[in-house]
């Protein structure tokens, strides 16, 4: 064998015993008539030597050592070689060592070209014998980063003020690659960062440096890991120890992108997240050991990347296709920010986009699946438009507002389902009538159902909001002058069981002046409470709503207000309130920024309220709150 | 099992002569460079000389060049130091070793003492 | 000829400790060096050859590694077994062969 280093090469070959066997005769270096067992080749020199045995192989080893200086000159980036060739050298086991020095302030990146890398452990071994070791620096102190075989998730490692990159290749591996480049990055200002990237499922286990000794003291050591968003991954910790700390605390810090709340920072000894859908950091922070007893800091850990399980795995198809002008929105519920780690909840279409907001359009069929440890987190918010432009076309046409099956049977809660309904201006008007009569929501008589409907207005300088709706009540259809929004609201899980409860139908109708009239037949026995719309706020300047009181023939309702002046101060107009019934057409009239509300009234057949407003001066509002209630006509109302 | 016993140690007057001998079992002298060391009363150690037989190869340290001789019997797998002319700084435990991968098997010692 | 200077002479430590002792040739010697322990009244072990290649059977506590012509043991976490005194030794076939003067690893 030859072997001729250039001069200026900076690379050192040495020749070496490998580990001890039992062999029954030694092999030596022959080198001008003298045996050995060493032999160092340095830049410039061209030594001619032989084995004295057969198969050399199977006791030496080779080491080929290129010392690459970034400090007094410029550094040779881009794709290493390995150099002298494979070729050119005895079939031993060998070693090629690159050993770069860089300031502190350089940061020095490997690329490893597809395979990428898998990091081992004490004691493990590659199965095809190709290891990759590599180590870094701390001013003079050499810091293991780890070793690695082939078929991993590794893809870069960056480093500063220097790195040593050991290839390990078996005497009969082919490979005449190194397979991996050198670039130079800005100061990472930290250990190491080690990017591993996930194609597809699939687990790394990673540990920090020099494991299983100790972590350098106050250092710190970042992983990052690129994931497929329709995947997620979970963090297990396999193995830890913590050192004794002095000053600071020693901890994992996670980064998310996209998340509030980062850092999210753990200790070592706290359950690490899991379900995280994307890309995320992993960083492990040393503190200021005690002098006396520092311990060690070590850290071994698990990174699993799979489909989401069990119920988060299926698919799900919302059909759309036949709907019109509806949008369905599946986003986070909103919770208090906490500091603690929430791990992604993220919903998924045709399972490759997945993003923690999903808007689905109507006209077609989407297929969506969870990627979510907990699918209470999200909920789904749904619009749809139904508007009339042709008031010829549209009179007296119905349609019903029913949450779509398809929605029912996804496993997100549903939130909102709101429907627009639009009419041409002054020409159509619209009524809702519900398939169980409705009660409205006051504080003295709550509705205590899974769902509710909100009705307002939806004429965007229009602030009208008619109030919230619950089935089981006495009022029997809504009039609406001109647009409004009806919202069916849940406010329980067990909405899905109480489902066949809503049911409420529009239909356009011809155009009346009153912003609202509600039609109320109360049951026997039953107190029915009313108030005003936009309760809280005041009742629209100039606005005019009206209740359609039915009282049955053998009852008498008794009407009461709940307060004894409405409290309203008008600036222009008046505010009044005229109470008819409806048969003999009498009324009464009260002014309701002067005079004192009506003391409780029976009515013996039914009736009219009619509450109008003035323009109220600020502060000032109508509101009013009254009930009805019915008793046989038999009872001595004296 | 590969092992070395050294002899022939004892007390001898100063300029008198000692043989040691190193008797190996497991393994043929023949193949390996085989040396002796030696250890002063609580000093430290002191490599003394080396053979390589089957090229006859003899390599001696300066404080013992042209009195000691080593030498080997490859048939009966022994490896000898003939010492002449001992001196009173010769007093040592004497080493035989086996060098492969280093000194990976060494004797159990033997005492020379030289003193009047 | 090459020296071989050990330091630190004799050192104390305590069970579960860190140790390191160092030894730096005169000149050149590549990566031909050994390490050797030794227990009163018993023959040198072999620990480390070429520097820092770990001898069969040697627990994996020893290691050893080359800066130039600074040569350094380890021994990561000391055991009941380690206290003893500990040798380098320069080259196999490049004479004469030399040793560094030991490190007596006592118990605190």
């Known amino acids: 064998f030859e072997i001729a280093l250039p001069r200026e090469s900076n690379i050192t070959v040495l020749i070496k015993l490998g580990t001890p066997t039992l062999l029954a005769k030694p092999c030596y270096i022959v080198i001008s008539k003298r045996h050995i067992t060493m032999l160092s080749i340095k830049s410039g020199e061209r030594i001619v030597f032989t084995f004295s045995c057969q198969s050399p192989e199977n006791h030496f080893v080779i080491e080929i050592q290129k010392n690459i200086d970034c400090m007094s000159g410029p550094c040779p980036f881009g794709e290493v070689q390995l150099q002298p060739s494979t070729s050119l050298l005895p079939t031993l086991n060998r070693t090629f060592i690159w050993d770069v020095k860089a300031h502190k302030s350089i940061g020095l990146e490997l690329q490893f070209s597809i395979p990428r890398l898998r990091q081992i452990g004490p004691g493990e071994s590659c199965p095809d014998g190709v290891t990759h070791s590599i180590s870094g620096r701390i001013d003079a102190t050499v810091v293991r980063i780890g070793t690695f075989c082939s078929n991993g998730t590794v893809s870069r490692i960056k480093m500063q003020e220097g790195v040593k990159m050991a290839l390990h290749l078996p005497w009969f591996h082919p490979r005449n690659v190194s397979g991996f480049s050198i670039a130079n990055r800005s100061s990472i200002k930290r250990l190491c960062i080690i990017e591993s990237v996930f194609e597809g499922e699939g687990s790394a286990t990673l540990m920090s440096a020099n494991y299983p000794e100790g972590f350098p003291e106050d250092e710190l050591m970042t992983w990052q890991f690129v994931v497929p968003a329709h995947l997620r991954a979970s963090v297990s910790f396999l193995n830890f120890n913590l050192s004794n700390c002095e000053r600071k605390e020693e901890r994992v810090e996670y980064y998310i992108p996209g998340s509030t709340t980062n850092p999210e920072v753990f200790k070592l000894e706290d359950k690490q997240p899991g379900n995280m859908a994307g890309n995320f950091n992993l960083s492990l922070q040393g503190c200021d050991q005690d002098a006396q007893s520092p311990g060690i800091l070590r850290l071994q850990f698990q990174v699993l990347v799979q489909h989401p399980q069990n119920e988060s795995n299926k698919i799900y198809v919302v059909d759309l296709s036949n709907e019109r002008a509806m949008s369905l929105t599946i986003e986070p519920r909103p919770v208090k920010q906490s500091r603690k780690f929430v791990p992604g909840c993220f919903v998924c279409l045709e399972s490759r986009t997945c993003s923690s907001n999903l808007t689905l359009t109507s006209g077609s069929k989407h297929k969506i699946s969870f990627l979510c440890d907990d699918l209470t987190r999200l909920w789904m918010n749904v619009e749809k438009t139904i508007s009339c432009t042709d008031h010829r076309y549209c009179q007296r046409k119905s349609y019903s507002l029913q949450v779509p099956s398809d929605i029912l049977h996804l496993p997100v809660e549903l939130h909102d389902f709101s429907w627009k309904l639009l009419v041409p201006k002054d020409r159509l008007s619209l009524v809702l009538v519900p398939a169980q009569k409705l009660q409205q929501h006051t504080h003295e008589k709550p509705c205590n159902t899974s769902f509710s409907y909100l009705v307002a207005s939806a004429i965007p300088s229009q602030d009208l909001y008619f109030g919230s709706f619950c089935p089981g009540g006495s009022i029997k259809q809504i009039q609406v002058k001109q647009n409004i929004s009806v919202t069916l609201r849940t406010f329980a899980p067990s909405f899905q069981q109480e489902a066949s409860r809503q049911g409420l139908t529009v239909s356009f109708i011809p155009y009346f002046k009153e912003e609202g009239v509600f039609t109320v037949t109360p049951d026997t026995k039953s107190k029915v409470y009313l108030r005003t719309p936009n309760w809280d706020r005041g009742l629209p300047s100039l606005t005019s709503v009206s209740w359609n009181i039915s009282v049955p023939r053998d009852q008498v309702a008794c009407l009461t207000f709940f307060k004894e002046r409405s409290g309203v101060v008008c600036q222009t107009g008046r505010a009044f309130m005229i109470i008819q019934e409806q048969r003999t057409r009498a009324e009464e009239i009260f002014s309701l920024d002067e005079d004192v509300l009506p003391k409780p009234s029976f009515h013996h057949h039914s009736f009219w309220v009619n509450i109008s407003n003035c323009s109220p001066t600020s502060g000032k509002q109508l509101d009013l709150l009254f009930s009805v209630t019915l008793t046989p006509r038999t009872v001595d109302l004296t | 099992e590969v092992q070395l016993v050294e002899s022939g140690g004892g007390l001898v007057q100063p300029g008198g002569s000692l043989r040691l001998s190193c008797a190996a079992s497991?393994?043929?002298?023949?193949?390996?460079?085989m040396h002796w060391v030696r250890q002063a009363p609580g000093k430290g150690l002191e490599w003394v000389a080396s053979i390589y037989s089957s090229y006859g190869y003899t390599s001696y340290a300066d404080s013992v060049k042209g009195r000691f001789t080593i030498s080997a019997d490859t048939s009966k797998n022994t490896a000898y130091l003939q010492m002449n002319s001992l001196r009173a700084e010769d007093t040592a435990v004497y080493y035989c070793?086996?060098?492969?991968?280093?000194?990976?098997?060494w004797g159990q010692g033997t005492l020379v003492t030289v003193s009047s | 000829d090459i020296q071989m200077t050990q330091s630190p002479s004799s050192l104390s430590a305590s069970v579960g400790d860190r140790v390191t002792i160092t030894c730096r040739a005169s000149?050149?010697?590549?990566?031909?060096v050994a390490w050797y322990q030794q227990k009163p009244g018993k023959a040198p072990k072999l620990l480390i050859y070429?520097?820092?290649s770990l001898y069969s059977g040697v627990p994996s506590r020893f290691s050893g590694s080359r800066s130039g012509t600074d040569f350094t043991l380890t021994i990561s976490s000391l055991q009941p077994e380690d206290f003893a005194t500990y040798y380098c030794?320069?080259?196999?076939?490049?004479?004469?062969?030399?040793f560094g003067q030991g490190t007596k690893v006592e118990i605190k």
């Open positions: 030794q320069q080259s196999y076939y490049v004479y004469p062969i030399t």
């Open positions: 497991g393994f043929n002298i023949s193949y390996y460079y």
């Open positions: 070429s520097a820092s």
């Open positions: 070793a086996r060098v492969y991968y280093g000194f990976d098997y």
């Open positions: 000149q050149s010697v590549s990566s031909a």
